[in-house]
C-alpha cells in the first residue's frame, strides 16, 4: 500500500485582519494510526495550533468532522485573524508511540499573511 502523504495544497493564503483563515490539509491514507497536529513555524520553537487528541483551541475549528472513521481531511479554520498570526503553518501526521507519539510526516507548509483590515 502507498505510504501516507500529507498534502497542503496552498503554498500561501492571505486574509484580512478580523476574518477567518482556512488552512487546508489532507492525508492520502489512514495508516499508520496516530493524531494530526497543526503548528506555526518549524523546529524546536514551533507553536502548537491544534492537536486532534486533546486540548482546548477556542479559535480553531476543523472543516471536516474528525469523528468520521474514514476522514482524511484535516483542514482547519482560525477565527479573528490578527497580524500576530502571520507565519507558516504545518500540518503534521504523527504515528502512535509510547510514551509519546512520533512525528511521521509533515506537509510542505502554508504561509499565512495578514492584510490590514479594510477601512
Amino acid at each position: 500500500e502507498d505510504e501516507l502523504q500529507v498534502i497542503q495544497p496552498e503554498k500561501s493564503v492571505s486574509v484580512a485582519a478580523g476574518e477567518s483563515a482556512t488552512l487546508r490539509c489532507a492525508m492520502t491514507s489512514l495508516i499508520p494510526v496516530g493524531p494530526i497536529m497543526w503548528f506555526r513555524g518549524a523546529g524546536a520553537g514551533r507553536e502548537l495550533i491544534y492537536n486532534q487528541k486533546e486540548g482546548h483551541f477556542p479559535r480553531v475549528t476543523t472543516v471536516s468532522e474528525l469523528t468520521k472513521r474514514n476522514n482524511l481531511d484535516f483542514s482547519i479554520s482560525i477565527s479573528n485573524i490578527t497580524p500576530a498570526d502571520a507565519g507558516t503553518y504545518y500540518c503534521v501526521k504523527f504515528r502512535k508511540g509510547s510514551p509519546d507519539d512520533v512525528e511521521f510526516k509533515s506537509g510542505a507548509g502554508t504561509e499565512l499573511s495578514v492584510r490590514a483590515k479594510p477601512s
Epitope: L30, I31, P32, V33, P35, Q52, K53, E54, E65, L66, T67, K68, R69, N70, R95, K96, S98, P99
Partner: antibody, heavy 118, light 107 residues
Framework: DVQLVESGGGVVRPGESLRLSCAAS????????MSWVRQAPGKGLEWLAG????????YYIDSVKGRFTISRDNPKNSLYLQMSSLTAEDTAVYYC???????????WGLGTLVTVSS | ALTQPASVSANPGETVKITCSGG??????YAWYQQKSPGSAPVTVI????KRPSDIPSRFSGSASGSAATLIITGVRVEDEAVYYC???????????FGAGTTLTVL
C-alpha cells in the same frame, strides 16, 4: 460527570423489533462519536455499531448490517439503536459507549437487557 | 481477532501482566476494559495503548509493541478481581473488536 443511561430493553418475541435509547449528560454530546456494544449471557463484549458526532456516518459489524440501525438526536442528547428481525441470539445486555478521538471507548452506560424468547 | 489468556492469578501486591495479540501495530489502537461482574457496566482502565483515565489508579498501566498490547497491574489488590477485556480499533477496517476476556483472580 459523564453519564450514559440506556433504556428500552425488555422481552420480545423472535421476529419483532425494539428501539433502544441512551440518554447522555455531563459532556457536549454533539462533539463525540458514540457506539453500541452488547454482551450475551455468559459471553464477552461485542461491538455492534458506531456513529459520527454529527450523525452522518454510521458503521456496523457484518452480523447486524441491515437489521440494526444506529442514529442520534443531538439536540436531545440521545443515541438510539433500532433493532428488527430479532432472534434468540440477540438476547444480551446492550451498552452505549462514548468514543475517544481514536474510536476506543472511555465511558459506558449501565446497560439495558434485551431478551428474545417465544 | 484479538487473543488473550482465559485466566491469570496473583497474590496481593504482585505484578500482573495480561497480554493481547492479533492486531497490527501500525493500524490498531488498544484499550483495556474492566468488568467486575457479568452484565455490569465495563470500566475503561486504559485506552490509546497506554493512556490511563484520570479516575483510574496509577497501578494500572498499558503498553503496545509489535502485534501485542499488555495491561500491567503493579501491586495488585483484591478489589482488582474482574474480567479484563482487550479492545482494539482497526484504522484499516473501521471496526472495533474485543478479546474473549481474561479472568483475574487475586488469591
Amino acid at each position: 460527570d459523564v453519564q450514559l443511561v440506556e433504556s428500552g430493553g425488555g422481552v420480545v418475541r423472535p421476529g419483532e423489533s425494539l428501539r433502544l435509547s441512551c440518554a447522555a449528560s455531563g459532556f457536549t454530546f454533539s462533539s463525540y462519536a458514540m457506539s453500541w456494544v452488547r454482551q450475551a449471557p455468559g459471553k464477552g463484549l461485542e461491538w455492534l455499531a458506531g456513529i459520527s458526532a454529527g450523525g452522518s456516518d454510521t458503521y456496523y459489524i457484518d452480523s447486524v448490517k441491515g437489521r440494526f440501525t444506529i442514529s442520534r438526536d443531538n439536540p436531545k442528547n440521545s443515541l438510539y439503536l433500532q433493532m428488527s428481525s430479532l432472534t434468540a441470539e440477540d438476547t444480551a445486555v446492550y451498552y452505549c459507549a462514548r468514543e475517544t478521538w481514536n474510536h476506543l471507548f472511555d465511558y459506558w452506560g449501565l446497560g439495558t437487557l434485551v431478551t428474545v424468547s417465544s | 481477532a484479538l487473543t488473550q489468556p482465559a485466566s491469570v492469578s496473583a497474590n496481593p501486591g504482585e505484578t500482573v501482566k495480561i497480554t493481547c495479540s492479533g492486531g497490527d501495530y501500525y493500524s490498531t489502537y488498544y484499550a483495556w476494559y474492566q468488568q467486575k461482574s457479568p452484565g455490569s457496566a465495563p470500566v475503561t482502565v486504559i485506552h490509546s495503548d497506554d493512556k490511563r483515565p484520570s479516575d483510574i489508579p496509577s497501578r494500572f498501566s498499558g503498553s503496545a509493541s509489535g502485534s501485542a498490547a499488555t495491561l500491567i497491574i503493579t501491586g495488585v489488590r483484591v478489589e482488582d478481581e474482574a474480567v479484563y477485556y482487550c479492545g482494539g480499533y482497526d484504522g484499516r477496517t473501521y471496526i472495533n473488536t474485543f478479546g474473549a476476556g481474561t479472568t483475574l483472580t487475586v488469591l
